[in-house]
Interface confidence: medium
């Protein structure tokens, strides 16, 4: 025998109190798949969270963070205060990147500068707290008669907090 509840589409639930009729999810709740016996309560984006996508009968609300804060964790489970570029957030607050590291965003951690010599290249532009080192041609390419110049290596993306 087929379960009558399997006919209930997303956005409804199989109401045992009403002879297993498919009833629409009540306000502020949703079901994202068919055959559900209950609807889930919508997430509320409160406090430091702000609504990025409204809840519908078939999908949960999605939150991001109010100005001055950014998301951390899967599905923006937390918000933390922004730091400046060239800093990272520690337990003591925002701290400048140590020498040899950089962060070009208001979030995330300081990452080491690209080590140009590991790739046999010269440093074209020195790294700063806010930006990665840019590698130039290898010293061998700079010998007289050499004409080709290796394009700078793309700056490595600093670690992102998941959105």
């Amino acid at each position: 025998l087929q379960d009558p509840c399997s006919n209930c589409p997303a956005g409804t639930f199989c109401d045992n109190n009403r002879n297993q009729i498919c009833s629409p999810c009540p306000p502020n709740s949703f079901s994202s798949a068919g055959g559900q016996r209950t609807c889930d309560i919508c997430r509320q984006c409160k406090g430091v969270f702000r609504t990025r996508k409204e809840c519908s009968s078939t999908s949960n609300a999605e939150c991001d963070c109010t100005p001055g804060f950014h998301c951390l964790g899967a599905g923006c489970s937390m918000c933390e205060q922004d730091c400046k570029q060239g800093q990272e957030l520690t337990k003591q607050g925002c701290k400048d990147c140590r020498f040899g590291t950089f962060n070009d965003q208001k979030r995330g951690i300081c990452q080491p500068w690209t080590n140009c010599s590991l790739d046999g290249k010269s440093v074209l532009v020195n790294g700063t707290k806010e930006s990665d080192a840019v590698c130039g041609p290898s010293p061998a390419d700079l010998s007289p008669g050499a004409s080709s110049v290796t394009p700078p290596a793309p700056a490595r993306e600093p670690g992102h907090s998941p959105q």
């Epitope: 984006c45 100005p67 800093q87 925002c94």
Partner: antibody, heavy 118, light 107 residues
């Protein structure tokens, strides 16, 4: 307890700059942001800008060209500077703390009255 | 910029009454609205954030509600110390903006 205290010049000549210091106690600037808001009879409350715990700043676009906010964590002081003042900048200027729960102001200073006049 | 409209500049009430102050946002701000109380010659005092969360130490006769564009601050059993101006603020996006305020007066 949490306190914020603004200190400013009172009277500023037109075209001159305004500097206000906000001295805080009962909390650390390493952990909390500080907003600047002004209030005038004609325009009500206007948000001017904020300096966050890490020192990053966000300004109201209407004031960004002539506004600067900085701070000294060790002295528990936040510095506000606005250039090229005109008569309509006459207002009470407040500093206020941002809590860790939302982009709002949970504690306010008593405000400093600034008149722009020659 | 998001405009916060408090259409009533003044509201008359009596001690013990229940009164509702309204605020309308020019666009959807979710629940990212705060309410402040300001008495003459004083700085604003935080009452409510996130449309409905009372700040610490705020009496429970103050209740916030609403989402999207329409918000209400309700004061039940008004006390004489509640006679003040009430201002709403949105913090959904920069620049942060305030309503013009509603003054609560005695009938």
């Amino acid at each position: 307890q949490v306190q914020l205290q603004e200190s400013g010049p009172g009277l500023v000549q037109p075209t001159q700059s305004l500097s206000i210091t906000c001295t805080v106690s009962g909390f650390s600037l390493i952990s909390y942001g500080v907003h600047w808001v002004r209030q005038s009879p004609g325009k009500g409350l206007e948000w001017l800008g904020v300096i966050w715990s890490g020192g990053s700043t966000d300004y109201n676009a209407a004031f960004i060209s002539r506004l600067s906010i900085s701070k000294d964590n060790s002295k528990s002081q936040v510095f506000f500077k606005m250039n090229s003042l005109q008569a309509d900048d006459t207002a009470i200027y407040y500093c206020a703390r941002n809590p860790l729960t939302a982009t709002v102001m949970d504690y306010w200073g008593q405000g400093t009255s600034v008149t722009v006049s020659s | 910029d998001i405009v916060m409209t408090q259409s009533q500049k003044f509201m008359s009430t009596s001690v013990g009454d229940r009164v509702s102050v309204t605020c309308k946002a020019s666009q959807n701000v979710g629940t990212n609205v705060a309410w402040y109380q300001q008495k003459p010659g004083q700085s604003p005092k935080a009452l409510i954030y996130s449309a409905s969360y009372r700040d610490s130490g705020v009496p429970d006769r103050f209740t916030g509600s609403g989402s999207g564009t329409d918000f209400t601050l309700t004061i039940s059993n008004v006390q004489s110390e509640d006679l003040a101006e009430y201002l709403c603020q949105q913090y959904n996006s920069y620049p942060l903006t305030f309503g013009a305020g509603t003054k609560l007066e005695l009938k």
